[in-house]
Each structure stands twice: as C-alpha cells, then as structure tokens.
C-alpha cells in the first residue's frame, strides 16, 4: 500500500524519495512517473535524472533538494485536483534487479477559504531519530530533517512507521508534509 501525502489546491506538493549515493557525485538514474511503478522504468514520466544531472522534466515538476546527495524528492508546483493519484519514484541502482521503487499517493484537497495556522508539535519525542523542524509558517510546508546516512531500508521502515502512526495522521490532517531522509 502507498504512503499518502496531502496538499491543497494552489500549493506546492512534496513527495519524498531518497537514496544514499555510494560516493559523492556517484549518482544513479532516477525516474518519477504519474501512476504506479510498472515492471521496469516509469510510466508517464514527469522527471528523470541520469548519472550526472536532471535530464528530463515537464512543467511544474522539479527537484527542490540536492539530488547530488540523493535527495530526489519531487515538488509539484501549484497543484490542482487533477494532480491527485499515485506517483512512482524509481531509483535504478545498477545490478541485477536492484531497483528500489516507491509508490506514493498524493491527495489534493480543495483550498481552505480561511487557512488555519499549523499547530506546533514536539516531533523529537515521537521520533528520536529525527532532528528539529524547519518552516513553521502557515503557508509553508513543514519539513523534518533526519540523519544524512539513512539507507533505503531505514527509509522504508520509517515511512511505514510514519504512515501507521497517529502523529502522521495528525500531521496530514493539519496539511503538513513529512519529509523522510
């Protein structure tokens, strides 16, 4: 089942995806597609990177993080209801059937007429692996930082913890987005 992320119409949506490059600048190809991950590659590609750079993108889709350090999280600009659905992040680690694939569900909510301020929370008590939060303004996306050497297995485990936790539900209900990695 997919991890669910939420955004409001008119806001930027954030879909997290990370890997740890074997060495700085030793990148692996990554593709993002609209729709669940197929058997190979991505369907309906919206953005892709190769071993050096972002080499394909479509309007409104970009990488906000440092993809050279393995942050290949997707930002979708100025979302509409049509942006709802499953997105595939595929990390094409070289080798025999080594790909890591993540299906992320994006739910777009209609814009609030009167936006309520985001509640402050103490995340470190619930998730001691995580550091402090950044970006507390009501119009900003709330972001959690974490240890830089987290691996893909930890990411998957952490994603499951977050998905299954009441904290994650509370965060989603308040319109905030959790960044893993």
């Amino acid at each position: 089942s997919e991890v669910e992320y939420r955004a409001e119409v008119g806001q930027n949506a954030y879909l997290p995806c990370f890997y740890t490059p074997a060495a700085p600048g030793n990148l692996v190809p990554v593709c993002w597609g609209k729709g669940a991950c197929p058997v190979f590659e991505c369907g309906n590609v919206v953005l892709r990177t190769d071993e050096r750079d972002v080499n394909y993108w479509t309007s409104r889709y970009w990488l906000n993080g440092d993809f050279r350090k393995g942050d290949v999280s997707l930002t979708i600009e100025n979302v509409t209801l049509a942006d709802s659905g499953i997105y595939c992040c595929r990390i094409q680690i070289p080798g025999i059937m080594n790909d890591e694939k993540f299906n992320l569900k994006l739910v777009i909510k209609p814009a609030k007429v009167t936006p309520a301020p985001t509640r402050q929370r103490d995340f470190t008590a619930a998730f001691p692996r995580m550091l402090t939060t950044r970006g507390h303004g009501p119009a900003e996306t709330q972001t959690l930082g974490s240890l830089p050497d987290i691996n893909l297995t930890q990411i998957s485990t952490l994603a499951n913890e977050l998905r299954d936790s009441r904290l994650a539900n509370d965060l989603r209900d308040s319109g905030a987005t959790i960044r893993i990695g």
Epitope: P29, G33, G35, A36, P38, V39, F40, E41, C42, G43, N44, V45, R48, E51, Y56, Q92, I93, P94, G95, I96, M97, N98, D99
Partner: antibody, heavy 121, light 107 residues
C-alpha cells in the same frame, strides 16, 4: 526503418551453452531498453530478460536467473544473451525486442524475426 | 507471478464482424497491459499499450479497454488481414507475463 536481426540459435545438448546476438539498426540503440522474449513450441510467449539503455541494470524471471545473462554493446548496436546450463524447456524461438522508456515505459514495440534454439540430446 | 487468463482460445469470425478477446489478470495491474498480434510465420506486432493506447500505424478498428484486472481487445469490422493470434501481456510487476493467446479464424 527499425530492424532487429537475431542470430546464434541452433541445436545444443542439455547442460550446454549458447550465445545469441541481436544486431539493431534504424534507431538510436543506446536510447532504448532491450529485451529477449521466447516463444515455446506450444506458441506461449515468455519474457526472458531485459537490460537498461546503459547496460547497468538487468532483469530476469526466476526461470532463467543465474543461467542466462543479458548484455549489450552500444558502440556496436548489439544485444546479447548468454545461455548456460540449458534445459529441454529452454527450447523456443528467441526474439529480441525494443523497449521505449524515456517519457513512458512501453514494452516491446519492435521485434526481430527470431532465432530458434533447440535443446535436445 | 501474475497469471493472464485469456479467453477464448479460438474464435471463428467473418469479415465485417465485431469480435472481442478478454484477458483477466490474477492481480491488480492498473492499466499496464499490452496487446500483440502474431500472424503465422511472423514475429509478434504491438497493437495496444497502457490498456487502450494504439501504437502508431495500428488501424482504429482495434480498440483496447479495461483497468485493474479485466481487459478487452475489440476488433470492429474484422478484415481478412486480421486473422492471426492475439496475445495480452501485463507489465505491472515482475515477471512480465503473457496470456496464452487467442486464435482468430475464418468461419
């Protein structure tokens, strides 16, 4: 015009090895994933292997994993399938096929004419 | 492995008829289904991908539909050159798997 021409098939004894080749022309070979698909004497189609455009990633079903190896030489516009420890059930016509992927993964949009592999004692 | 159950195995038709071939996936495959046509002595030729998108040059009388687990290839106004074997394939998850085929024959 896209062309895929397979070669290297033949009769081989169980436990033997064979190397198939596929010569590609009419398109930018290094911009496509490539696959091998086989068709059994009963006319069933079976996916055998797929390789990424750079050759860095390879994919196999369990039935041939550890026995077959797909590879490519982009400088020579060539695709290969090294088949070891062959079994009677590997008897089939082997097709090489092109897989577009850049903006949307699409399986096998062009196929070669096939090369026949017979495994028998 | 996802099993693609294709029906019928054989279908008799006449020129001008409308025929449908179905494929049922044993698991959810979204719209990751392709259809291929194979004439005797030839290699398979792609007709449809993403369940309903025709490949370049494929006549409009070939229509694909379905999503999830149930898929259909419809040939309206069958022509004599359509007499062939038709295969579905799922490319949602590994291993990529094919249906057993449907042979379209003249009555």
């Amino acid at each position: 015009e896209v062309q895929l021409v397979e070669s290297g098939g033949g009769l081989v004894k169980p436990g033997g090895s064979l190397r198939l080749s596929c010569a590609a022309s009419g398109f930018t070979f290094s911009s496509y994933y490539m696959s091998w698909v086989r068709q059994t004497p009963e006319k069933r189609l079976e996916w055998v292997a797929t390789i990424s455009n750079s050759g860095g990633s390879t994919y196999y079903p369990d039935s041939v994993k550890d026995r077959f190896t797909i590879s490519r030489d982009n400088a020579k516009n060539s695709l290969y399938l090294q088949m070891n420890s062959l079994r009677a059930e590997d008897t089939a016509v082997y097709y090489c096929a092109r897989d577009p992927y850049y903006t949307n993964y699409v399986p096998m949009d062009y196929w070669g004419q096939g090369t026949t592999v017979t495994v028998s004692s | 492995s996802i099993v693609m159950t294709q029906t019928p195995k054989f279908m008799s038709t006449s020129v001008g008829d409308r025929v449908s071939v179905t494929c049922k996936a044993s698991q959810y495959v979204d719209t990751y289904v392709a259809w291929y046509q194979q004439k005797p002595g030839q290699s398979p030729k792609p007709l449809i991908y993403s369940a309903s998108t025709r490949h370049t040059g494929v006549p409009a009388r070939f229509t694909g539909s379905g999503s999830g687990t149930d898929f259909t290839l419809t040939i309206s106004n069958v022509q004599s050159e359509d007499l062939a074997e038709y295969f579905c394939a799922q490319y949602s998850s590994s291993p990529l798997t094919f249906g057993a085929g449907t042979k379209l024959e003249l009555k």
